[in-house]
């Protein structure tokens, strides 16, 4: 009896793993062995498929063959058993694009309200993956235990810390990844479960800002008890993409090291341009709180915010102010690359009552003065991306005599 | 493979100093941290200290830092652990370790035996 | 200092039983904390890391348990291979410290 070829052949890849399945075409005929040929692009010749020879089952493995995971590949299946059938081609196919990506790793860490996510790609050293490691984004979906009240995060990366949470309670949550720019989305991790600790005595401190004073940044932040010393600690943004580095090597701020008001300043200079975290922990002597929530924190636009400098030139009805850019130690100009809108308020020096106007323009009419009347004004930049939503410190108030009448022009 | 081989055994007399050296294989030290750790005879495990081999920065235990001097040497990929002032007290075997992560020493060098003895 | 305490300086146990280390921090140190196994005459060897997730290569019979101030190593189906002392370390705080150590002994 003539043996049958094989049919339906499905290619499953996920990660570097390379599973073939198939239909057996005659059930009814015993002790039938699959064999698999390969050929790459531009060769005439058929190679034996290594981990796919002479099968007794429908599924076989050839994730030890090496190939060019960009290059397009055709297969073909025969059944034998004392003769053996026709071969059976399958449609070819670039391994890259068929590739699905597989679970990623996850370790959980808890603390009393929040829990830390370390993700790594599910197969360490990916060949499949390797031009695209730092590519990976990774998406969430949490829940309470209790609850199954589920909540999704989009685009995280190999470090994520959730907040916010339940003390002594277990959260469950699942992970995948994904390649935006290969449009590829992966597989859920299986599900993992952590209860968080017991409250602990100290809170981590919060509202933690950075604002720019003369050659220093201010650092600030909020805590609920007195007499404690706080640190504070930074790492490069970029260090919590490093696909599988769960080390992060955080780094003390000299002038914030075991300091004991609820802020520090620290010189310019202590960052080169670029995007940081920056985390406080409180102690008190014996006890220590978490960190508190890490905050982002970019010297570009840090640096930029200063507050406008600006000149007035006074008229009997009105001021007309010149907005310029912000000087730094040696008067020199800050360059600006983010657009900005300036918020001017303005008073009379006799009255506490004080209007505002919000321009983009840098040169701004404040209208309806009266002569000879002594007015202050004051100035402060904010970025225009919502993003960044950043706000610069109000300038030093600046006073001025409008001119007596008729001197509009 | 993973490895940490750690200098051989060394006898020395009290008040003088002596150098450690701890060569990483198989991984870049620059991206993890080297630590130290103290070992008595009979006694438990006692963290010196650890530095950054990527920037040289550095932690100790207060108690140690009159004591020990931890640096690093990236192009050899060697940590150094030295000893001053030393006494029969500082008589142990020292480990050097990898700090990886989560912070855990997930590898140990096979240990330096310090003795000082006059 | 975060101090972690290992209350039972010995513990004895036979073949194929199994016993728990127990390892007290404290104050709250989440879940990070790690166990290695020290057996005589070698350097110690990594077997947990955040409180409860094995080292490749390390027999799944450990399991490592616990958070905030209480932690416990348990070995369940004890070998003598088994018989060595066991140390928990926090890794909460950079300065890192150790508990005293567990000694197991095999009857």
């Known amino acids: 009896k003539n043996l049958k070829s094989p049919q339906k052949v499905e290619v499953d890849i996920i990660d570097d793993n390379f599973i073939l399945r198939w239909n057996r075409s005659d059930e009814s005929v015993g002790n039938v062995t699959f064999s698999f040929d390969y050929q790459k692009t531009g060769m005439d010749n058929w190679i034996k498929l290594s981990g796919c020879q002479n099968i007794t089952s429908t599924k076989c493995n050839f994730s030890s063959l090496k190939l060019n995971v960009y290059e397009e590949i055709k297969l073909r299946i025969r059944a034998e058993k004392e003769n053996t059938s026709s071969w059976y081609e399958v449609d070819s196919f670039t391994p890259f694009r068929k590739a699905q990506i597989g679970p990623p790793e996850v370790h959980l860490e808890a603390e009393d309200k929040a829990i830390v996510i370390h993700i790594s790609p599910g197969t360490k050293d990916s060949v499949m993956w390797a031009l695209d490691g730092l590519s990976f984004t990774y998406s969430l979906v949490i829940w309470k235990n209790s609850s199954g009240v589920e909540e999704r995060i989009e685009n995280i990366y190999s470090r994520h810390k959730i907040y916010k949470l339940s003390p002594e309670t277990t959260y469950c949550l699942k992970v995948k990844a994904a390649l935006l720019t290969s449009w590829k989305i992966g597989v859920y991790s299986p599900v993992h479960c952590i209860k968080t600790t017991v409250e602990n005595e100290l809170p981590p401190p919060e509202n933690i800002e950075v604002s720019v004073q003369n050659q220093n940044y201010v650092l600030k932040w909020d805590y609920t008890y007195a007499n404690m010393t706080f640190q504070v600690q930074w790492l490069h943004a970029f260090l919590k993409r490093n696909p599988g580095n769960h080390l992060y090597k955080w780094k003390q701020i000299p002038d914030c090291e075991n300091v004991k008001t609820t802020q520090c300043v620290f010189p310019q200079n202590v960052f080169q341009k670029g995007i940081y975290l920056l985390r406080v922990q409180a102690s008190d002597g014996n006890n220590t709180s978490f960190w508190s929530e890490e905050i982002k924190f970019d010297t570009e636009i840090q640096a930029f915010l200063l507050p406008p400098v600006f000149n007035i030139r006074s008229l009997s009805d009105s001021f007309h102010i010149y907005i310029g850019a912000p000087k730094q130690s040696g008067n020199t100009p800050v360059i600006q690359d983010y657009p900005l809108i300036y918020e001017i308020i303005f008073w009379e020096n006799t009255s506490n009552a004080e209007r505002k106007i919000i321009e983009k323009k840098t040169d701004v009419t404040v209208p309806n003065l009266k002569p000879l009347t002594v007015y202050c004004v004051k100035a402060r930049a904010h970025t225009m991306d919502e993003k960044l939503n950043k706000s610069s410190v109000f300038s030093d108030a600046v006073c001025e005599k409008t001119k007596p009448g008729n001197t509009s022009k | 493979d993973v490895q940490l081989q750690q200098s051989g055994a060394e006898l020395v007399k009290p008040g003088a100093s002596v150098n450690l050296s701890c060569t990483g294989s198989g991984f870049n030290i620059k991206d993890y941290y080297i630590h130290w750790v103290k070992q008595r005879t009979e006694q438990g495990l006692e963290w010196i200290g650890r530095v950054d081999p990527e920037d040289g920065e550095t932690k100790y235990v207060p108690k140690f830092l009159d004591k020990a001097t931890i640096t690093a040497d990236t192009s050899s990929n060697t940590a150094y652990l030295q000893l001053s002032s030393l006494t029969s007290e500082d008589t142990a075997v020292y480990y050097c370790t990898r700090g990886g992560n989560y912070y855990a020493m997930d590898y140990w060098g096979q240990g330096t035996s310090v003795t000082v003895s006059s | 200092d975060i101090v972690m305490t290992q209350s039972q300086k010995f513990m004895s146990t036979s073949v194929g039983d199994r016993v728990s280390v127990t390892c007290k921090a404290s104050?709250?140190?989440?879940?990070?904390v790690a166990w290695y196994q020290q057996k005589s005459g070698q350097s110690p060897k990594a077997l947990i890391f955040l409180a409860s997730y094995r080292y490749s290569g390390v027999p799944d019979r450990f399991t490592g348990s616990g958070s905030g101030t209480d932690f416990t190593l348990t070995i369940s189906n004890v070998q003598s291979e088994d018989l060595a002392e066991y140390f928990c370390q926090q890794c909460n705080n950079y300065r890192l410290t150790f508990g005293s150590g567990t000694k197991l002994e095999i009857k």
């Open positions: 104050q709250n140190v989440g879940t990070n």
